[in-house]
Interface confidence: low
């Protein structure tokens, strides 16, 4: 089975603009690519399956996404802890200043899809 987690965080050193509402723009695609790459670095262990549903919202830039892991390999607390530990590295590697991290379980039945 697969476990899903909803993650939200702020990137306080970026400005939201209308191009982040349009997945065809360079800004949207570059930010999406860099965030995807970042998460592959954070959750390197075998249980990480990927992420989906990246959305950008106003408020500097608010990022919302869903993370997928093999069932039983990680819990909400560890997802949040690992992400918070990575914030310094995110600043250096990806020029992203991250704050206001929030993680929650994606409730059944979505998590039952595997």
């Amino acid at each position: 089975g697969v476990s899903f987690f909803f993650l939200s965080f702020h990137i306080s050193n970026l400005q939201f603009n209308s191009s982040l509402e349009d997945p065809s723009t360079d800004y949207y695609q570059e930010l999406q690519r860099d965030i995807s790459e970042m998460f592959l670095q954070i959750y390197k262990q075998g249980g990480f399956l990927g992420l989906s549903n990246i959305k950008f919202r106003p408020g500097s830039v608010v990022v919302q996404l869903t993370l997928a892991f093999r069932e039983g390999t990680i819990n909400v607390h560890d997802v949040e802890t690992q992400f918070n530990q990575y914030k310094t590295e995110a600043a250096s590697r990806y020029n992203l200043t991250i704050s206001d991290v929030s993680v929650s379980d994606v409730p059944f039945p979505f998590s039952a899809q595997s």
Partner: antibody, heavy 123, light 111 residues
């Protein structure tokens, strides 16, 4: 003052291993990557990989994977680079360097370097 | 891997004249508007010294005759008025993707 002080020169035989140390001082050791770069005689610079001392996370250049190991001792603020199965082409000066930021955290770059450790591989 | 092609291999310039070194990346080194390219100066027997970070920012304490420019794949280091102490080898470095890669170096001499 940020300083990286490396261990002394080494002479090794082919097939042996070498372990070079890099002691950091003058800054918070844990959150900054330490890079390892080597330079063969008369040649350019080559990135070997890096370690984040606080977590032990490492990234290696595939060219050296399996032969090089980075470790960190946070009690002594020291990083180690061990290279095994040495061959003559490994004769080089090995540098450690800090991937650091300015005081405002406004940029990151390899800003401070150790003095270099000469490793000679010869039978 | 990102290949950094530096040119020329060597450069002889008269004192007080301009020296220009180029570095071309095999793919973009830009990330969210920041170009992750850095320039270093190395003198014999010494470790490299950071001159320019993020393509165009002058490191603290570096003389302002050094400047960097460029974006995405093409970058330039300029010494506006060469001084005797600038004789050295200059390297570009990309830190956009692992493995980080250096240019092959440019040796700057006095003509």
């Amino acid at each position: 003052e940020v300083q990286l002080v490396q261990s002394g020169a080494e002479v090794k035989k082919p097939g042996a291993s070498v372990k070079v140390s890099c002691k950091a001082s003058g800054y918070r050791f844990i959150p900054y990557w330490i890079e390892w770069v080597r330079q063969a005689p008369g040649q350019g610079l080559e990135w070997m990989g890096e370690i984040l001392p606080g977590t032990g996370r490492t990234n290696y250049n595939e060219k050296f994977k399996g032969r090089v190991t980075f470790t960190a001792d946070t009690s002594t603020n020291t990083v180690y680079m061990e290279l095994s199965s040495l061959r003559s082409e490994d004769t080089a000066v090995y540098y450690c360097a800090r991937y650091g930021d300015d005081t405002s955290g406004g940029y990151y770059a390899v800003d401070y370097w150790g003095q270099g450790t000469t490793v000679t591989v010869s039978s | 891997d990102i290949v950094m092609t530096q040119s020329p291999d060597s450069l002889a310039v008269s004192l007080g004249e301009r020296a220009t070194i180029n570095c071309r990346a095999s793919e973009s080194v830009n990330i969210l508007g920041t170009n992750l390219i850095h320039w270093y100066q190395q003198k014999p027997g010494q470790p490299p010294k950071l001159l320019i970070y993020h393509a165009s920012n002058l490191e603290t304490g570096v003389p302002d005759r050094f400047s960097g420019s460029g974006s995405r794949t093409d970058f330039t280091l300029t010494i506006s008025s060469l001084q005797a102490e600038d004789v050295a080898v200059y390297y570009c470095l990309q830190s956009r993707k692992i493995p980080w890669t250096f240019g092959g170096g440019t040796k700057v001499e006095i003509k």
